[in-house]
């Protein structure tokens, strides 16, 4: 992968593809500039991920200008939320998470874009994962790692998002108990970021620790192959 973008500087509001280990290049927006005074985020931008509405701190080498890269990275992907992210970056690039709070760092100075009131049940929860980036050591994850049922991970299309209910007991699907109803039929959260402590993902139950692999590109392919083998086809669930 070319690292020619290593020295590129971004400004607030810039649209990018952001790369996190174990995840495809994801449509994102620069939300905050690096703050030299804060060691853990020096030279890192806070990025907002479209589709999942999570945030993470990433260095410039993991950021790729959107317009220049969309041919390369903007192809539909099986990860949940990715297709929605592609739509949002094109059609709704100023979207904010419900209940979003900016941190005290250099946040973007935008035209005052009114944001919706926090939705019940999805404005107060913290993200499930937080910590430093891949280069800085292990990711700290709030919840114990768990293998969720990944069958149906390919079913990313609207109209084909819910599993056939008898096959998936609620208890097994949502052991953490948080937002039980809302999360019942979810398969996986796509981009479980190092979520900033005071940011608020808008989706119920957002965040699951990214895989801790070393060779990320190979692992992505391996994971996709595994999903392909396990998951039923996207389009084979027309009736409940």
């Amino acid at each position: 992968m070319s690292r020619s973008n290593r020295q590129k500087e971004y400004k607030c509001g810039d649209l990018v593809f952001a790369k996190m280990k174990g995840y495809p290049h994801w449509p994102a927006r620069i939300d905050e500039m690096p703050e030299a005074a804060v060691k853990s985020t020096a030279n890192k931008y806070q990025v907002f991920f479209f589709g999942t509405h999570e945030t993470a701190f990433l260095g410039p080498k993991d950021l790729f200008p959107y317009e220049e890269s969309k041919e390369k990275f903007g192809k539909p992907n099986k990860r949940k939320g990715f297709s929605e992210g592609l739509w949002e970056i094109e059609n709704n690039p100023t979207v904010k998470a419900s209940g979003y709070q900016s941190s005290q760092k250099k946040s973007c100075v935008e035209e005052p874009e009114p944001e919706p009131e926090a939705a019940e049940g999805d404005g107060d929860k913290k993200g499930n994962a937080e910590g430093s980036s891949d280069e800085e050591g292990k990711l700290v994850i709030d919840e114990p790692a768990k293998e969720k049922n990944e069958k149906g991970a390919l079913k990313r299309r609207a109209g084909d998002l819910l599993e056939d209910s008898p096959k998936r007991p609620k208890e097994a699907e949502n052991p953490e108990g948080e937002e039980k109803e809302a999360a019942t039929l979810e398969v996986e959260r796509p981009l479980p970021m190092e979520v900033e402590k005071n940011s608020t993902p808008s989706e119920p139950g957002s965040g699951r620790g990214p895989p801790q692999e070393e060779e990320e590109e190979e692992d992505e392919e391996e994971e996709a192959t595994k999903e392909d083998a396990e998951a039923p086809g996207i389009r084979d669930h027309e009736s409940l």
Epitope: G81, F82, W87, S98, A158, G159, D160, L162, R235, L240
Partner: antibody, heavy 120, light 106 residues
Framework: QITLKESGPTLVKPTQTLTLTCTFS??????????VAWIRQPPGKALEWLAT???????RYNPSLKSRLTITKDTSKNQVVLTMTNMDPVDTATYYC????????????WGQGTLVTVSS | DIQMTQTTSSLSASLGDRVTISCRAS??????LNWYQQKPDGTVKLLIY???RLHSGVPSRFSGSGSGTDYSLTISNLEPDDIATYYC????????FGGGTKLEIK
């Protein structure tokens, strides 16, 4: 700017086949992730989804009408065609087409609708 | 099929009011819910997608919430332009609309 426009007969007779065309601009149905849906609304009643076609020719139909519906696309003309067989007066409705993206974004852009009356 | 029920078919409110429109699904739809506005002239617009996300260009006085089977659309400061019929729609399993709630000014 995305626009969609429905066209077709305003009056059809019972038992006839209705053919409606959705002509759109501002997007292409050859683009991955894009779909077009048909929705109808009988006078004074609620919206009812009929059918969806995706960029890769995958189709979805309303189960209660599936046997009567066919949805096709002509990518080069930026058109989607819905045919509905064996029309009945209860099928009198305003028929809409709308653009949809493949994950979670709803019917983002709608046509103005075309009123079809089924009567002998 | 998943059924969507909007128990209130019509609603009267005053300008400036905070209005809430409810929608119930026949089963858990995991937040796969959109809200649409249909104006008296028949024009339909997407307002909110995925339960609480505001579609581009929609005023911030609109907000959505809910989980499981129960969802709601709130208009925080009713304006004359909000006179319309509002529909919920699930998209987890095919697509189904609610019966609509017609909003009128007192």
């Amino acid at each position: 700017q995305i626009t969609l426009k429905e066209s077709g007969p305003t009056l059809v007779k019972p038992t006839q086949t209705l053919t409606l065309t959705c002509t759109f601009s501002g997007f292409s149905l050859s683009t991955s992730g894009i779909g077009v849906a048909w929705i109808r609304q009988p006078p004074g009643k609620a919206l009812e989804w009929l059918a969806t076609i995706w960029w890769d020719d995958d189709n979805r139909y309303n189960p209660s009408l599936k046997s009567r519906l066919t949805i096709t696309k002509d990518t080069s003309k930026n058109q989607v065609v819905l045919t509905m067989t064996n029309m009945d007066p209860v099928d009198t409705a305003t028929y809409y087409c709308a653009q949809i993206y493949d994950y979670a974004v709803g019917f983002a852009y709608w046509g103005q609708g075309t009123l079809v009356t089924v009567s002998s | 099929d998943i059924q969507m029920t909007q128990t209130t078919s019509s609603l009267s409110a005053s300008l400036g009011d905070r209005v809430t429109i409810s929608c119930r699904a026949s089963q858990d739809i995991s937040n796969y819910l959109n809200w649409y506005q249909q104006k008296p002239d028949g024009t339909v617009k997407l307002l909110i997608y995925y339960t609480s996300r505001l579609h581009s260009g929609v005023p911030s006085r609109f907000s959505g919430s809910g989980s499981g089977t129960d969802y709601s659309l709130t208009i925080s400061n009713l304006e004359p332009d909000d006179i319309a019929t509002y529909y919920c729609q699930q998209y987890g399993k095919l697509w189904t609309f609610g019966g609509g709630t017609k909003l009128e000014i007192k």
